[in-house]
């Protein structure tokens, strides 16, 4: 005897109570493949979750996180708090970066400022909680008498002849 359920398309379920007739999925449920004997309950995007894609009879709803949070896990199963620039997420919430570290994003950890002296350079712009230091020329380049009276010629763009 042929299983009539295999003929039921996505968006329906095989109703054994009605001689294996294909019945549409009830409201707030779906079946994404054919031949299903039940429809699955639609995911509800509540609280810190917001709806990215509404549930249909053939596909589940898709959730996103509300402003101030970002998705984690498969299919955005979790919402993790964003922090401000200059902070990092700790187990006890968002905390300011310690002195000597920075974070220029809403996620991730505070990272140490670049140590300019390791490259033989000097600090041109001091670092902050939100920004790394900017390294400049080496201290030797900045010493008196090290600079020439005439500035260096500007670099030419390839394919352009001098004016």
């Amino acid at each position: 005897l042929q299983d009539l359920c295999s003929n039921c398309p996505a968006g329906t379920f095989c109703d054994n109570n009605r001689s294996q007739i294909c019945s549409p999925c009830p409201p707030n449920s779906f079946s994404s493949a054919g031949g299903q004997r039940t429809c699955d309950i639609c995911r509800q995007c509540k609280g810190v979750f917001k709806t990215r894609k509404e549930c249909s009879s053939t596909s589940n709803a898709e959730c996103d996180c509300i402003s101030g949070y970002h998705c984690l896990g498969a299919e955005c199963s979790m919402c993790e708090q964003d922090c401000k620039q200059g902070q990092e997420l700790t187990k006890k919430g968002c905390k300011d970066c310690c002195f000597g570290t920075f974070n220029d994003q809403k996620r991730g950890i505070c990272r140490p400022w670049t140590n300019c002296s390791l490259d033989g350079k000097s600090v041109l712009v001091n670092g902050t909680k939100e920004r790394d230091v900017v390294c400049g020329p080496s201290p030797a380049d900045l010493s008196p008498g090290a600079s020439s009276a005439t500035p260096p010629a500007p670099a030419r763009e390839p394919g352009h002849s001098p004016q």
């Epitope: 990092e88 700790t90 187990k91 006890k92």
Partner: nanobody
Amino acid sequence: EVQLLESGGGLVQPGGSLRLSCAASGFTFSSYAMSWVRQAPEKGLEWVSAISGGGGSTYYADSVKGRFTISRDNSKNTLYLQMDSLKAEDTAVYYCAKEGTTETDDYHYNMDVWGQGTTVTVSS
């Protein structure tokens, strides 16, 4: 493939107890600290508790201190969370999470693998 599978959630009355388990596979369990993290219906993720790889150091969020106990059985690759004196505000989906290091603390947030979660509902 690294996998974490939680179990033990359910409906419990205020003041009651539950014990959550997390079965780990696909990595050397004893080499990594583990955490429990929860997400209440209207809130983002909240860290609950952490334990070092060897089990010698444990840490708790202030909201669960004295009521919850984290433990692990490295011979069974399993993490536990004993939850006593449960309150309505403990209602959440509870996730176990692998940390990126052997040692842990109550500050650094370095979870890198998460389970699917188990739902705990505290209601009369």
